[in-house]
């Protein structure tokens, strides 16, 4: 039976059982400060003209963007401004062949974060340059509160506690 | 626990809802799924509303059957029911951790005549 | 879409003996499979999920095997208690979008 098409954010380790995983911790921060949401300056790399992109020095290209795999682990807000100091962003998935593309680069099991998570005050899951999930195009299973942000594994999407520490990937 | 009311005696397409009332579940963390049994007949998955409130339907339901929530109940709506949709309509939590999808905790059912 | 094939429909055993149930997927699902077991006027109870992780509870007669489209429960040592119809239930999920499906069912009945 179809459910629906698109990328699954599957729950986060535990089961849903406990009617409370974690407590809301009030708004995310980085720097000190509310996330922003990206802005379009932020997003310097246009899509198209794949063939105009000159991607920096370890950082892959793929319809038009570049893509950064860290080695190294951080929590999600972590993750997110050691991107946009970059002048990048955590990785937003557009499609399906966006994905392949990911997982064939990643070559590990565990999770990695990239730039999704539920905003408190718009109360949806919501991609780091501001717009919302498409639920017809994105299943997202786990956690819909504060202090849930996003990683993915093996072509899926999990829900995880911002906090934890992992792998991320940065995108311009 | 999960306990699901609403079952009745309906006439062919008058709209029915079914509601399942939750208890010590945090339907912010848990999808719920709605399955039917006709009876005598085998187990039929109807639709999931998951956390976020977005709702996702068996390709047979879609058009025929609405889920919706509050922070504590969990409603099914049967847009125009037919005689095929007789059967207990049970409410089900998913408690699958990580990669898995399971359902361990179901209602007792409540059952709908048309 | 993923289509769950369980055969038998239905099998009898005496006190004792061994039931053999099995479940065939479409397509390759992993390990994400569940069985479940329903009693009349009863809602279905979950006895095995990640094709062989035995839910909390549950007896150890019950056991789950298999991974793909290949799955096996096997009820060894049957009590009369273990009178019931079992059903599989598969997720395939991915990229590709997300299915759940039922098994037809199997009814134990117990001598």
């Known amino acids: 039976l179809l459910v629906s098409q698109g990328v699954l954010l599957k729950c986060q380790k535990g089961s849903c059982s406990n009617a409370t995983q974690y407590e809301d911790t009030g708004d995310l921060k980085v720097n000190n400060g509310t996330r922003r949401n990206i802005s379009n300056k932020d997003l310097c790399a246009s899509r198209s003209a794949d063939q105009t992109v000159l991607c920096q020095s370890e950082w892959l290209k793929y319809q038009g963007k570049c893509y950064w795999f860290s080695n190294e682990m951080k929590s999600w807000s972590d993750s997110y401004v050691y991107c946009l100091e970059r002048k990048s962003h955590l990785l937003i998935i557009h499609d399906q062949l966006e994905m392949a593309f990911i997982q064939k680069n990643l070559r590990q099991l565990n999770y990695v974060w990239i730039g999704l998570n539920f905003t408190s005050l718009k109360m949806t899951w919501t991609w780091v340059d501001g717009s919302p999930i498409d639920s017809k195009i994105f299943f997202i299973k786990g956690p819909a509160k504060e202090n849930s942000c996003a990683a993915i594994k093996e072509s899926k999407i999990f829900s995880e506690t911002c906090s934890s520490v992992f792998k991320w990937i940065c995108q311009y | 626990s999960v306990e699901e009311s609403g079952g009745r005696l309906v006439t062919p397409g008058t709209p029915l809802t079914l509601t399942c009332t939750v208890s010590g579940i945090d339907l912010s963390s848990c999808a719920m799924i709605w399955v039917r049994q006709a009876p005598g007949e085998g187990l039929e998955y109807i639709g999931l509303?998951?956390?976020?409130?977005s709702a996702y339907y068996a390709s047979w339901a879609k058009g025929r059957f609405t889920i919706s929530k509050t922070s504590t109940t969990v409603d099914l709506k049967i847009t125009s029911p037919t005689t095929e949709d007789t059967a207990t309509y049970f409410c089900v939590r998913d408690g699958g951790t990580d990669d898995h999808f399971y359902f361990n905790l179901w209602g007792q059912g409540t059952l709908v005549t048309v | 879409d993923v289509v769950m094939t369980q055969t038998p429909a239905s099998v009898s055993e005496p006190v004792g003996g061994t039931v053999t149930i099995k479940c065939q997927a479409s397509q390759s699902i992993g390990r994400n499979l569940a069985w479940y077991q329903q009693k009349p006027g009863q809602p279905p109870k979950l006895l095995i999920y990640?094709?062989?992780t035995l839910e909390s509870g549950v007896s150890s007669r019950f056991k789950g095997s298999g991974s793909g489209t290949e799955f096996t429960l096997t009820i060894s040592g049957v009590q009369c208690a273990d009178a019931a119809t079992y059903y599989c239930q598969c997720t395939d999920y991915g990229s590709s979008g997300l299915f759940f499906a039922f098994g037809g069912g199997t009814e134990v009945v117990v001598k």
């Open positions: 990640s094709a062989s």
């Open positions: 509303i998951n956390t976020d409130g």
